[in-house]
């Protein structure tokens, strides 16, 4: 995470800070998981493309009453330009596949780390 600095800061929160905090929160969730995350709730899998932040929020927002991911839900709203409501779906969802929230978080984290290795963040 020490490599994530140095971005331009066109918005109110520097993009590097927002991303660092999102990744740190995903790391916390995966590391601190004892009981099944969100009682084993299932969410729609998503295609991990450049629009994945909105898709991830659309998927996770359908999980209610799970305090462990509330911060992630709030943070993802800062990455999605559009208003996201429960029950809303874009074509980024692979709607024939549901996975556990724990696996969803793990996949998202791994993908973000992969993108950093590839230098895909401005």
């Amino acid at each position: 995470l020490t490599c994530l600095g140095g971005f331009a800061s066109p918005g109110p929160v520097p993009p590097s800070t927002a991303l660092r905090e999102l990744i740190e929160e995903l790391v916390n969730i995966t590391q601190n998981q004892k009981a099944p995350l969100c009682n084993g709730s299932m969410v729609w899998s998503i295609n991990l493309t450049a629009g994945m932040y909105c898709a991830a929020l659309e998927s996770l927002i359908n999980v209610s009453g799970c305090s462990a991911i509330e911060k992630t839900q709030r943070m993802l709203s800062g990455f999605c330009p559009h208003k996201v409501s429960a029950g809303q779906f874009s074509s980024l969802h692979v709607r024939d596949t549901k996975i556990e929230v724990a696996q969803f978080v793990k996949d998202l984290l791994l993908h973000l780390k992969k993108l950093f290795r590839e230098g895909q963040f401005n």
């Epitope: 331009a8 450049a50 659309e58 559009h82 895909q120």
Partner: antibody
Framework: EVQLVESGGGVVQPGRSLRLSCAAS????????MHWVRQAPGKGLEWVAI????????YYADSVKGRFTISRDNSKNTLYLQMNSLRAEDTAVYYC???????????WGQGTLVT | EIVLTQSPATLSSSPGERATLSCRAS??????LAWYQQKPGQAPRLLIY???NRATGIPARFSGSGSGTDFTLTISSLEPEDFAVYYC???????????FGPGT
Amino acid sequence: EVQLVESGGGVVQPGRSLRLSCAASGFTFSNYGMHWVRQAPGKGLEWVAIIWYDGSNKYYADSVKGRFTISRDNSKNTLYLQMNSLRAEDTAVYYCVKGSGDIPFDYWGQGTLVT
Amino acid sequence: EIVLTQSPATLSSSPGERATLSCRASQSVSSYLAWYQQKPGQAPRLLIYDASNRATGIPARFSGSGSGTDFTLTISSLEPEDFAVYYCHQRSHWPPIFTFGPGT
């Protein structure tokens, strides 16, 4: 039917200011991120700025950063672009563009010319 | 900053022929690439997003392929209304910066 109608373009001297407006209809404006994209005469497309559905985040192309400000009034279904310290190279048709979850530019206005 | 290069700059074709347009990114953009069509005096129109997904209302003769750095837009059999400028486009993952190719 989604409609985006730009206005406010015209001829302006270098160094002066201009404000463009975009009236949106046919969709729930307050739910969507919006962009400005421009096209210089005979040239290609250049993204200018994006604003979040609630105005909470704004991002700009390097070429306009510090000079242009994107804003919106959701009660009026209107998007704005305040352009200060205008330069000759800002001459272009300015398009107002709607985004969606996975498609940044899914509906475009017809554009307004700034010279 | 990712730079998109399109080739050829100009493609001369006739109705009924197959047209293949290329877009190359200076670094990997995964599968996030879109194609737009623009006719003189008109606003651009979305054709393809996420490299290969046709937008609503786009005829099946338009198809997109590729991933990483090399992408292709294919028009299987050109119709008279297909003669236009085509732009490829990508967005960075974060922050949201949007880039267009120079057009074909």
